[in-house]
Amino acid sequence: KAMHVAQPAVVLASSRGIASFVCEYASPGKATEVRVTVLRQADSQVTEVCAATYMMGNELTFLDDSICTGTSSGNQVNLTIQGLRAMDTGLYICKVELMYPPPYYLGIGNGTQIYVIDPEPCPDSD
């Protein structure tokens, strides 16, 4: 059976360039080790934004230099991407892999379109 991954269709980043969304997966088994990857798709090119492997019940830990942070609760991952600019507007896909125990399962979300609007510069004051 395929693993279903759900994520919101659209998210608007804050004026500070922060976007948050929930990635939820329907686990066919009792996974203890899960890897979550955020991918960006633009013009059919796919690139990795960030990735984290976590043990069920433990916190989700991205690398120190990652632009992502997140928390996990059961089969739900709350993802936050920071430092976004207008040029980063695009489709962000949540990919979930159940790494352990067997069998391995792959789940690919339909993607969240994140819109980023650069803030207008403050006008000079006299």
Epitope: K1, A2, M3, H4, P28, E33, R35, T37, L39, V46, T47, E48, A51, T53, I93, K95, M99, Y100, P102, P103, Y104, Y105, L106, I108
Partner: antibody, heavy 118, light 108 residues
Framework: QVQLVESGGGVVQPGRSLRLSCAAS????????MHWVRQAPGKGLEWVTF????????YYADSVKGRFTISRDNSKNTLYLEMNDLGTEDTAIYYC???????????WGQGTLVTVSS | EIVLTQSPGTLSLSPGERATLSCRAS???????LAWYQQKPGQAPRLLIY???SRATGIPDRFSGSGSGTDFTLTISRLEPEDFAVYYC?????????FGQGTKVEIK
């Protein structure tokens, strides 16, 4: 550009061992899971084994379980396949393949031929 | 284990004709997890289609994929001389990863 180059194939007697290598270049090796796939002469493709990003998780086809061991050295950008107790049914071209971001095997090596014969 | 059955085993066609290859799964495969590969003699397989219908980089638009659930199709709209090869479907949604037995497209 992405390149996968297998080596280590050859002729080996039944019951003996062989170690295959797959040298990867042109991409960040540690960011991808990897596979070995084999193809017996004149036959179709058979998935053999999978290894996770850090090498902690490994999966094997029933036909090789207990005899083959997959491993990787991310510092050397190299994938390995240790094959023990080889039988004539293991005669095949062995390909290493990279898992693409969305799951399919997007890049393959040219293959290395393993012939098990007495 | 998901078993993939391809049909026909061999397809004899002329250049310019349309080729329709079938892949049937023993249980439901999400369309996100079905791929098609092309293999020519003496060469490694090459990814053509992933996610049931997305073309891989550099693949001409005469190749198209369709289907969902247990039935998938690869269509080559107009066969070019270089398209005569063996085609494999594959599911990659769960272990063990499995391939169909292949369909050979040969010149009539």
């Amino acid at each position: 550009q992405v390149q996968l180059v297998e080596s280590g194939g050859g002729v080996v007697q039944p019951g003996r061992s062989l170690r295959l290598s797959c040298a990867a270049s042109g991409f960040t090796f540690s960011s991808y899971t990897m596979h070995w796939v084999r193809q017996a002469p004149g036959k179709g493709l058979e998935w053999v084994t999978f290894i996770s990003y850090d090498g902690n998780n490994k999966y094997y086809a029933d036909s090789v379980k207990g005899r083959f061991t997959i491993s990787r050295d991310n510092s050397k950008n190299t994938l390995y396949l240790e094959m023990n107790d080889l039988g004539t049914e293991d005669t095949a071209i062995y390909y290493c393949a990279r898992t693409g971001w969305l799951g399919p095997f997007d890049y393959w090596g040219q293959g290395t031929l393993v012939t098990v014969s007495s | 284990e998901i078993v993939l059955t391809q049909s026909p085993g061999t397809l004899s066609l002329s250049p310019g004709e349309r080729a329709t290859l079938s892949c049937r799964a023993s249980q439901s495969v999400g369309s996100s997890y079905l791929a098609w590969y092309q293999q020519k003699p003496g060469q490694a397989p090459r990814l053509l289609i992933y996610g049931a219908f997305s073309r891989a980089t550099g693949i001409p638009d005469r190749f198209s994929g369709s289907g969902s659930g247990t039935d998938f199709t690869l269509t080559i709209s107009r066969l070019e001389p270089e398209d005569f090869a063996v085609y494999y479907c594959q599911q990659y949604g769960s272990s063990p990863w499995t391939f169909g037995q292949g369909t050979k497209v040969e010149i009539k």
